[in-house]
Amino acid sequence: QEEDLPRPSISAEPGTVIPLGSHVTFVCRGPVGVQTFRLERDSRSTYNDTEDVSQASPSESEARFRIDSVREGNAGLYRCIYYKPPKWSEQSDYLELLVKESSGGPDSPDTEPGSSAGPTQRPSDNSHNEHAPASQGLKAEHLY
């Protein structure tokens, strides 16, 4: 009998409000035994896969997706899903990435990276838990 897979979690380092041109790393976490993590965008057809999975704790594994230089087009909602043979998990909640001007003008978000406000999480619509493809590697630039 197949086990019930826990939903993955998603977070961003150093935070969810990132200055233009700075780096951000999405961290996807799931149980041990994960073979593939996938990072998806909300309204875009692009996604990133990685099989570079590390053990974060005795009961948890993780994968990291890094964007070296954040652009305005990187702003938006992201979510994770993982494959633990023989099946895929449900998707995580969405995490919202905000990109602000480096100068920090009047329209900049109040929340700074790493601040206590924490990541914005939105429920993922798991009634349409689909989408598709895969590309290897840790870089997430093409999710733009």
């Epitope: 593939t36 309204s43 875009r44 057809s45 692009t46 996604y47 990133n48 896969d49 899903i81 494959y83 023989p86 099946k87 895929w88 619509d125 349409h128 838990n129 689909e130 989408h131 598709a132 493809p133 895969a134 590309s135 093409h142």
Partner: antibody, heavy 115, light 111 residues
Framework: AVKESGGRLVTPGTPLTLTCTAS????????IQWVRQAPGKGLEYIGA?????YTYYASWAKGRVTISRTSTTVDLKMTSPTTEDTATYFC?????????????WGPGTLVTVSS | ELVLTQTPASVSAAVGGTVTIKCQAS??????FAWYQQKPGQSPKLLIY???KLASGVPPRFKGSGSGTEFTLTISDLECADAATYYC?????????????FGGGTEVEIK
């Protein structure tokens, strides 16, 4: 590569299962769509099996076909074909990193429904 | 259900010329869009996806643009080998399922 099989001449109402076989890649990562083309006509979407195990159908295909997958194949079962289902049936796999484009297509398998 | 309206149904152009094909979606489909080329007796070939990315091996004479509901395929410096039927497709799987529809096709003749 992907390759369709199972196409043949059948009489109306005779169930028929077409199989899309994947080779050279891990099927679990990909969406597979089924598309058909009647002689001299355009491409018609039938449905898709997504990597996460969900299945979607064109509105006209609901109740007429069933799509299922194993670790290496995606099947299209035609429950009660009619003469209007005569066509070449294609399966296709989406491109790495983007769900929007299907870069890998099989050669197609011909289904003829005739009494 | 999503409808893709593709125009024109057919077009004729000279070698070295330019052809523009348009595809209009009845609902916004974001980047879930692609263009295909099909020649008689062959399987469709992916040209453009995402909806402006060039598929592997496709020459840059083929250009895709647009987003949301309006999409365009432009073929410049036409060659005899470009004679084919071109299809647009949405492959959207989203909060509202709009998925997998094809446009009606555009037959391109090279004079």
């Amino acid at each position: 590569a992907v390759k369709e099989s199972g196409g043949r001449l059948v009489t109306p109402g005779t169930p028929l299962t077409l199989t899309c076989t994947a080779s050279g890649f891990s099927l679990y990562k990909y969406n597979i769509q089924w598309v058909r083309q009647a002689p001299g006509k355009g491409l018609e979407y039938i449905g898709a099996s997504t990597y996460a195990g969900y299945t979607y159908y064109a509105s006209w295909a609901k109740g007429r076909v069933t799509i299922s997958r194993t670790s290496t194949t995606v099947d299209l079962k035609m429950t009660s074909p009619t003469t209007e289902d005569t066509a070449t049936y294609f399966c296709a796999r989406h491109i790495d990193g983007d769900y929007s484009g299907y870069a890998l297509w099989g050669p197609g398998t011909l289904v003829t429904v005739s009494s | 259900e999503l409808v893709l309206t593709q125009t024109p149904a057919s077009v004729s152009a000279a070698v070295g010329g330019t052809v523009t094909i348009k595809c209009q979606a009845s609902q916004s489909i974001g980047t879930w869009f692609a263009w295909y080329q099909q020649k008689p007796g062959q399987s469709p070939k992916l040209l453009i996806y995402g909806p402006s990315k060039l598929a592997s091996g496709v020459p840059p004479r083929f250009k895709g643009s647009g987003s949301g509901t309006e999409f365009t395929l432009t073929i410049s410096d036409l060659e005899c080998a470009d004679a084919a039927t071109y299809y647009c497709q949405s492959t959207y799987f989203g909060v509202d399922y709009l998925g997998g529809t094809f446009g009606g096709g555009t037959e391109v003749e090279i004079k």
